[in-house]
Every structure is written in C-alpha cells, then in structure tokens.
C-alpha cells in the first residue's frame, strides 16, 4: 500500500508559530511498541501454493539496517500433487514502508526519513486476460 | 518480517563526539524516494485464491496518517470452481513498519519512531498439522 | 494451547448410525473451524466435514453428503457428527480437528467400524 506525499505539512509548526531552523527538526530517541513482534504462522513462504525466497539487505546507515525482500519462486502456482500450474500465477504483494538514513560529517549527524518498496511475500491469483489487437 | 531493536546505538554520535542533548537528534525535512510507488497487478486482493479485504486506519498524528489493514476474507483458499476448499487456509502476510508520531504542547513540537504491524495481504499454505494428545 | 477431547464411535452394521463428539478448549481465533478427517491404513487423509466457528459454514466430502450431519454448540466449543446410512467405506479412524488459519489440530482419533 502506498505512503502518501507529505507535503511537508506534517513536519511543520502551526501557522502561527515561528518556523523551523534550518529545515529540521527534534526526532526524540526511542521507539514506541518497540517490542511489539510480528506472529506469523510458521515458514509460509514455503507451505505457500505461491512461495517465495528471502534476500537480505544489509545498510548499517539505515534504520533498520536489515531490510527483507521475498521473490515468488515461481510464475505458475503450486497444486495440490505438489506441480507448478501455469494457469494461475504467483505475484509479489508489495508495501511502501520508512526507514531513517543516518547522514553524518565528523561529530555533526542527522537524520532524514526514506521510502523504501518492501516486497513483503507472493500471493496466488488468477491472471487477467488482455485480448491484444 | 521483524525490526530488530535499536538499542538505541544507530541514533548515537561517535564515543568521541558530545552526547546528544536531551534526549532528541535532528530530524532533516523532507523524504528520499518520496516518489517511488507500490507497482502491483491490480486488484490482487480479489483475484488472490486467499482474497483478503481492506481497512483504513487514520490519525493525522501520525506520519503516514492512512495504515492500511488487510483481513484474509476466509479461513480456506478459492479452488478452480470458486467454492472455497478448507483444506487450505488463508493465512496473513504481516509486515513490521515505521511510522513517525507527532507530540507537540503549544509551538513546541517533537517526533519519534513508532513501530506498527501491518497485515499487508494474504496467501494460500498448506497448514501445519499438530497431534494433539 | 489446544485440546481437544473425542468420544463415541464403535461398530455398527450397513445402514446403521453412530454419533461423534467432539470438544476443543484452548486459544480459539474467530477465522477457525472444526470437523473431523478420517484415515484408511495406507491411504491418505480425507476431510469428512467440517464447521466454521464464528459464521457456521458447513462443508462436507461428497462421499458423506446427505448422510453425515455436523452440528456445533456454540456455548462450549462442542461438535457432534451424526452418521447415518453407514457403509462399509465408511471403516476409518476418525480425527477431530480444530483448524487455526495455518495450523490444523488432531486429535487421539476414534475407531468406527462398519461390517456389512
């Protein structure tokens, strides 16, 4: 699903406060539901009938530095007599998501907030058919 | 897929450098790869043999201020015949995200990370079978 | 965690009847069903009927359909399985299940036997 533009406006004072110096601002360290964890069912990727890899991402200037992205292991679907049917395709389900870059010179660091197109795991679905002139 | 805790460490100067004051760091306005877009086949939601629906979540304190939901819309997944086989089951794909949560008390406004879950679609498996005694 | 506790089964004759129960205690999400499967020695599994916990959707094998009746008592997580017009393929053991989207639980299962 898709982030959308800021505008900017979600960063800035109300109008009738003096504007921010220098076009940054107070990020408090911290996270909140820092603890909170995802309870996935065991090792979908694999038991899927569209199933998928993993590739790691590794950036110690960003956080988080790992980011996970899942590839469909196959163009077709697997049946139930454990065979790829091409008459169903596996396809990516993709989510726009944050991260934050650590800029820094000597001891002056800050941070900027950054997109990133997280492929999240595939999905099973009958293709659309376009009749072509 | 999971982000790992920061302890804190991605968001600190050097050893060799002065802490940080107060508890907060600087912010940059503005988003890299604010333009990057979700490219998925359309409608997957529907057409996935483990269809899922979607809710929406606003707070215009956070940062994006729309997080989107999916609920997997049956326990089994959608055979050939449309009629739903539950001897498959619908499960979630769940994906750990950043958002950023605005605070502010009168001109004086400050940020921070916060971590939410997002169910950002479904899939078909095989479920796991457990003997119970 | 699940539990799951079966009772009745046994043997009865061509165009007889049983009854089997079945309860399940333990973590029970509103996506779940219960039902049972039944397993031949050297054969696969099969999905006899099952119930949806919340929406009480019905699905049943199309070997069973008009025979076997599933019926669930929402107050204690109880399903019965009525089985008329017993046919001798219908010999098995059978499975309780409960059914967490990913996670099929299994009972001890119960022995039914029809002679012909």
């Known amino acids: 699903r898709k982030i959308p533009k800021v505008g900017h406006t979600f960063f800035q004072k109300p109008e009738s406060c003096p504007p921010v110096p220098g076009g940054s601002m107070k990020l408090d360290i911290g996270i909140i539901n820092e603890n909170q964890r995802v309870s996935m069912s065991r090792n979908i990727e694999s038991r899927s009938t569209s199933p998928w890899n993993y590739t790691v991402t590794w950036d110690p200037n960003r956080y988080p530095s790992e980011v996970v992205q899942a590839q469909c292991r196959n163009l077709g679907c697997i049946n139930a007599q454990g065979k790829e049917d091409i008459s169903m395709n596996s396809v990516p389900i993709q989510q726009e998501t944050l991260v934050v870059r650590r800029k820094h010179q000597g001891c002056s660091v800050s941070f900027q907030l950054e997109k990133v197109l997280v492929t999240v795991g595939c999905t099973c679905v009958t293709p659309v058919i376009h009749h072509v002139q | 897929r999971k982000i790992p805790k920061v302890g804190h460490t991605f968001f600190q100067k050097p050893e060799s450098c002065p802490p940080v004051p107060g508890g907060s760091m600087k912010l940059d306005i503005g988003i890299i790869n604010e333009n990057q877009r979700v490219s998925m086949s359309r409608n997957i939601e529907s057409r996935s043999t483990s269809p899922w629906n979607y809710t929406v979540t606003w707070d215009p304190n956070r940062y994006p201020s729309e997080v989107v939901q999916a609920q997997c819309r049956n326990l089994g997944c959608i055979n050939a015949q449309g009629k739903e086989d539950i001897s498959m089951n619908s499960v979630p794909i769940q994906q750990e995200t950043l958002v950023v949560r605005r605070k502010h008390q009168g001109c004086s406004v400050s940020f921070q990370l916060e971590k939410v879950l997002v169910t950002v679609g479904c899939t078909c498996v095989t479920p796991v079978i457990h003997h119970v005694q | 965690q699940v539990q799951l506790v079966q009772s009745g089964g046994g043997l009865v004759q061509t165009g007889g009847s049983l009854r089997l129960s079945c309860s399940v205690s333990g973590d029970i999400s509103s996506q779940s069903a219960m039902g049972w499967y039944r397993q031949v020695p050297g054969r696969q599994r099969e999905l006899v009927a099952m119930?949806?916990?919340?929406?009480?959707?019905?699905y049943y094998a199309d070997s069973v359909k008009d025979r076997f009746t599933i019926s669930r008592i929402n107050a204690n997580n109880t399903i019965h399985l009525q089985m008329n017009n017993l046919k001798p393929e219908d010999t098995a053991i059978y499975y309780c299940?409960?059914?967490?989207?990913?996670?099929?639980?299994m009972g001890q299962g119960t022995q039914v036997t029809v002679s012909s």
């Open positions: 119930i949806h916990t919340t929406k009480g959707d019905t």
């Open positions: 299940t409960h059914n967490e989207p990913g996670d099929l639980y």
